[in-house]
Interface confidence: medium
């Protein structure tokens, strides 16, 4: 075995925006530190066969399979994949090791399989086997976290049944409103599953894995806060756990909290209380109402009452499956070129939606904001006054929703012209859709006022580019106009644009643009 080469097999993962991958260099730039695939001699195989650890790759990821050979002299090599031979160009690194690389750009199903590398050195021949498969992210899940009470302790456990195992963190904030935004200095994060400090203003639990991040807020009624004008509403699906926290602060301990569902006290075992003194010696009490697995009959008004505060209520609605309620009829808008305008969709949904805005096959991030009346709203303002079709798409675990918008920008026509031996055509994308006139320029009509009506064919809205209509007009050439200049004009309520075309010369035609406001 002394004469066997020392072989190292590595995997290099490239970040998707790594412009160096696939460049002409046979040694692409490394984006991340190489991962050792530990090439081991395969026992009981005829010949010398090394086997690398199996490689799992995400769809569309870019990787390099690399072999480092510590053997004297020159080497030659050949890659074989699915019975096809692939060129192989070894080179030597600074330590004088032979380096052989296989770059796989934007991994697809067709690129998965066994890659065989045959290497011939002065001393011996050997084979290296790589097995590349697509990581089955179909089995991946990321579920919204939920809460459980810790056995025999006043603490909450945050659970997210996700694959791969998620990192769970509590996101705590003790101030109000805007200052509780994710990156605010008022926000404290604790990367642990159990939380004992349950007196804070805003408590959320988040779970994250390769699929992203999902959070659940601990629904809270604060008797010291001015409530929303309308009753807050909490949706849950049958079988999910219900947790509502009621919080109150008073100058001393002489007050109590109670929960009622539809004017009936909650049963023992469906609530627990905690209290503490705050820094200014006032007493904070919290009372949790919880149901480990809700049924339809847990629907109703949950009211938290105090002997020293106004009571407050929340409406809990239990549904069989999630929903997205919104009007899906398409909407058309017509705006001026500099008018401020946003598309907006008002919806009610449970569980929370994931959404995108799409224009011209390009997706834009989607933000949603809760309104006072239990609805949410998503707005899109980044249209940059481009006319066309905009699509709002939303989905959650149980429902999908799509709404189409058309944006028309009021503007004067702009004319483009093209001509062939037999006809001249003009195109315009102004809005409202323009009307067309053709005029002949001659000695009799040097100002091109002689109207042409014969041989004109107008097509309104003949090409729909992502919802943007284009109007065209074609003039069939006749002997009467050959050799003359003709002018096509498009006009709408905002103005007129014209193009002048010379109709005699073969080859490229000179166009003279002429704008009239």
């Amino acid at each position: 075995n002394q004469d066997l080469p020392v072989i190292k097999c590595v995997l290099i993962n490239h970040k998707n925006n790594d412009s160096s991958v696939g460049k002409s260099s046979s040694y692409p730039m490394v984006s991340e530190s190489p991962e050792d695939l530990g090439c081991a001699l395969r026992p009981q195989s005829s010949g010398t066969v090394y086997e690398a650890a199996a490689v799992e790759v995400d769809v569309s990821a870019s990787i390099t399979l690399q072999v480092l050979v510590d053997a004297p002299g020159n080497i030659s090599c050949l890659w074989v994949f699915k019975h096809s031979s692939l060129n192989c160009q070894p080179h030597f690194d600074l330590q004088n090791r032979g380096v052989v690389s296989m770059v796989i750009l934007k991994m697809t199903e067709t690129q998965a399989g066994e890659y065989l590398l045959f290497i011939q050195s002065e001393a011996t021949n050997y084979t290296i086997l790589f097995t590349v498969s697509i990581r089955n992210t179909l089995l991946y899940t990321l579920r919204r976290p939920y809460f459980r009470k810790m056995e025999n302790q006043d603490a909450l456990v945050c659970i997210s049944e996700s694959v791969p195992e998620p990192i769970v963190e509590w996101v705590l904030c003790d101030s109000q409103g805007e200052s509780c935004k994710e990156e605010s200095p008022a926000v404290v994060k604790k990367e642990e599953k159990v939380l004992h400090e349950l007196f804070g203003t805003d408590i959320r639990c988040c779970a994250r894995n390769e699929l992203g991040r999902e959070c659940t807020r601990l629904f809270t009624i604060d008797l010291n806060q001015t409530p929303q004008t309308t009753l807050p509403q909490l949706f849950l699906k049958v079988g999910e756990p219900l947790w509502i926290r009621c919080k109150a602060v008073h100058v001393n301990h002489g007050f109590g909290l109670t929960w009622e569902l539809e004017n009936k006290a909650l049963e023992e075992g469906n609530y627990f209380e905690m209290s503490t003194y705050s820094t200014n010696r006032t007493m904070i009490r919290i009372l949790f109402a919880f149901v480990s697995s809700v049924a339809r009959n847990d629907t109703g008004y949950y009211t938290c009452s105090s002997s020293k505060h106004p009571s407050q209520s929340a409406l809990v609605t239990i549904v069989e499956k999630g929903f997205i309620n919104a009007t899906n009829s398409s909407e058309d808008y017509e705006i001026d070129q500099y008018e401020e305008f946003c598309f907006s969709v008002r919806f009610k949904a449970y569980p929370q939606i994931r959404c995108t805005w799409t224009f011209s096959r390009k997706s834009f991030p989607c933000e949603q904001k809760g309104l006072d009346n239990g609805y949410s709203i998503s707005k899109f303002c980044n249209h940059k006054h481009q006319p066309g079709e905009y699509i709002f798409h939303a989905e959650n675990d149980d429902a999908q929703f799509t709404k189409m918008f058309t944006l028309n920008i009021r503007r004067k026509p702009q004319v483009l012209a093209e001509a062939s031996a037999s006809q001249a055509s003009c195109f315009s994308d102004g809005y409202p859709l323009p009307s067309w006139t053709w005029k002949k320029c001659s000695d009799k009509s040097p100002n091109c006022t002689e109207e042409i009506t014969e041989g004109v064919w107008n097509r309104k809205a003949n090409r729909k580019v992502f919802g943007q209509w284009v109007s065209s007009s074609t003039l069939n050439m006749s002997e009467a106009i050959k050799g003359f200049l003709v002018k096509c004009c498009a006009y709408n309520s905002l103005g007129t644009s014209c193009e002048t075309i010379l109709l005699n010369s073969p080859g490229p035609f000179p166009f003279i643009q002429d704008n009239i406001s």
């Epitope: 009624i221 008797l223 010291n224 806060q225 001015t226 409530p227 929303q228 004008t229 309308t230 009753l231 807050p232 509403q233 602060v249 008073h250 009211t303 105090s306 002997s307 020293k308 505060h309 106004p310 009571s311 407050q312 209520s313 409406l315 609605t317 009610k348 006072d372 009346n373 239990g374 609805y375």
Partner: antibody, heavy 121, light 112 residues
Amino acid sequence: QVQLVQSGAEVKKPGASVKVSCKASGYTFTSYYMHWVRQAPGQGLEWMGLINPSSGSTSYARNFQGRVTMTRDTSTSTVYMELSSLRSEDTAVYYCARSGSGGSYFLFDYWGQGTLVTVSS
Amino acid sequence: DIVMTQSPLSLPVTPGEPASISCRSSQSLLHSNGYNYLDWYLQKPGQSPQLLIYAASTLQSGVPDRFSGSGSGTDFTLKISRVEAEDVGVYYCMQALQTPLTFGGGTKVEIK
């Protein structure tokens, strides 16, 4: 029975401040929100804001922000509404009104008798 | 802010006859919990306002059942089945969906 008794009529000069009181009785003072609503002569009703008597937290209408202050004294079950930088258009009857418990639905089940504030130079 | 518009401005009525007042809001007052956040108040001459109807159609206790409220979303109606002399005054609708709470301009009901 529930009663809301307001302080007497006031005459003030432009630029001055006025403080109107509303004394509650016949119910647990800290368990109901108190609102202030005003009515200019021959005009309709205009909501000014509310106070949570338990915590003292307030919510004011935008038109009055910066000029109105609502406070409470739990020992006397009284709420106060102070309006500063008075102008002639602040001449109105000012009402305190209680909103039902249950918390989030604001309906005015009891009203004070009203306090006429006249702003005149 | 939500704008409340009432009509008519003035309503002369005959005792024993029905009367109807309309109230329109600039945005829907229907909450996702199914309730319409609209109340009706009556202010009799020289008195403080009093609550008649809340949540668009629920009669406040102690209010005669000749008063009824209906409507949903943005259009609401207060009906008096048979007007009595004591019903004169100014009727106001009020939205309680969001702060600031806003009132309609009022409808003055008087005997013909």
